[in-house]
């Protein structure tokens, strides 16, 4: 039975040209995290494997940095970066947990927000 929950930064905003840290946290489970995949809608941004470390997808290498921790830093933001981001936790023995973050990249200076929450499901 999957008892864990993913906490995320929820809905966040950042300025064009700036950077943002995407963070998720898995709690309420003793399952071992074997890998975390970071995805942007339909694209794979990066994989953090518990043993092997980080692999940043080649198309994002110039503006994605690993960390802090299991998080991901997006740099040189453009308005096209606005959208949904997902952290996918591969765990043993539970299976897969998914958290969602919505990023809005603003053209000019403006207020930012932080939220919480997330959801989880299991891939068979």
């Amino acid at each position: 039975m999957m008892t864990g929950t993913i906490e995320t930064t929820g809905q966040i905003s950042a300025e064009k040209g700036g950077s943002i840290i995407l963070q998720c946290h898995l709690s309420s489970t003793t399952a071992q995290v074997t890998q975390v995949n970071w995805e942007q809608q339909d694209q794979l941004l990066a994989i953090c494997n518990a043993d092997l470390g980080w692999h940043i997808s080649p198309s994002f290498k110039d503006r994605v940095a690993p960390g802090p921790g299991l998080g991901l830093t997006l740099q040189s933001l453009t308005v096209q970066d606005t959208g949904e981001y997902f952290c996918i936790y591969h765990t043993y023995p539970d299976g897969t947990y998914t958290g969602r973050i919505f990023l809005e990249v603003l053209e000019s200076s403006g207020g930012g927000g932080a939220g919480g929450g997330g959801h989880h499901h299991h891939h068979h």
Epitope: I47, W54, H55
Partner: antibody
């Protein structure tokens, strides 16, 4: 230039233990990367067996986990595979390979030439 | 376990022609796919990683494409040394799996 070379008995009896080593030249296996075993039954596709990371951690294919041990011999710059309780289904060409995860993800970029192991009495 | 299914099992092509090989994943693997070439009696050779990036020293006639569950390896103009078996592999999950292979033979 990194080179990998498998060695070990070409014939193992059923219920016995298959033991292979992979000698690595051109790179110290305790300096980086992960070091893998992959097998290929005659006329069939490839199956990942498991790896040892340079840090010493290991990870195995769940379907083989109960029978597999992969370890490193630092002094000889080689790593080994032990597969216990073998049956005819374990007859295959066994390859060792290197994975540069940071650059190429889970793709294996250097391979040994492979060694055929037959399980038969 | 993510199952990778390759088609066709055998592809007959004349030298100089284009070859298109297919690989389908049983679930979404984004772009975490590699392609290998294997000739008889030899080890696999890495061609493509991250679905579309050529490995060092691989000729430009080899190209990979796709995302999600459907992937393609294209050899634009087959040379005599390209007749071999080709395998796809996924590394989206922590248990890496390979396809069954496509044999490219001379027509």
């Amino acid at each position: 230039q990194v080179q990998l070379q498998e060695s070990g008995p070409g014939l193992v009896k059923p219920s016995g233990t298959l033991s292979l080593t992979c000698a690595v030249s051109g790179y110290s296996i305790t300096s980086g990367y992960s070091w893998h075993w992959v097998r290929q039954p005659p006329g069939k596709g490839l199956e990942w067996i498991g790896y040892v990371h340079y840090s010493g951690s290991t990870n195995y294919n769940p379907s083989l986990k109960s029978r597999v041990t992969i370890s490193v011999d630092k002094s000889k710059n080689q790593f080994s595979l032990k597969l216990s309780s073998v049956t005819a289904a374990d007859t295959a060409v066994y390859y060792c390979a290197r994975m540069d995860y940071g650059n190429y993800g889970g793709a294996m970029d250097y391979w040994g030439q492979g060694t055929l192991v037959t399980v038969s009495s | 376990e993510i199952v990778m299914t390759q088609s066709p099992a055998t592809l007959s092509v004349s030298p100089g022609e284009r070859a298109t090989l297919s690989c389908k994943a049983s679930q979404d693997v984004r772009t975490a796919v590699a392609w290998y070439q294997q000739k008889p009696g030899q080890a696999p050779r890495l061609l493509i990683y991250s679905a579309s990036y050529r490995y060092t020293g691989i000729p430009a006639r080899f190209s990979g494409s796709g995302s999600g569950t459907e992937f393609t390896l294209t050899i634009s103009s087959l040379q005599s040394e390209d007749f071999a078996v080709y395998y796809c592999q996924q590394y989206y999950s922590t248990q890496w799996t390979f396809g069954g292979g496509t044999k490219v033979e001379i027509k």
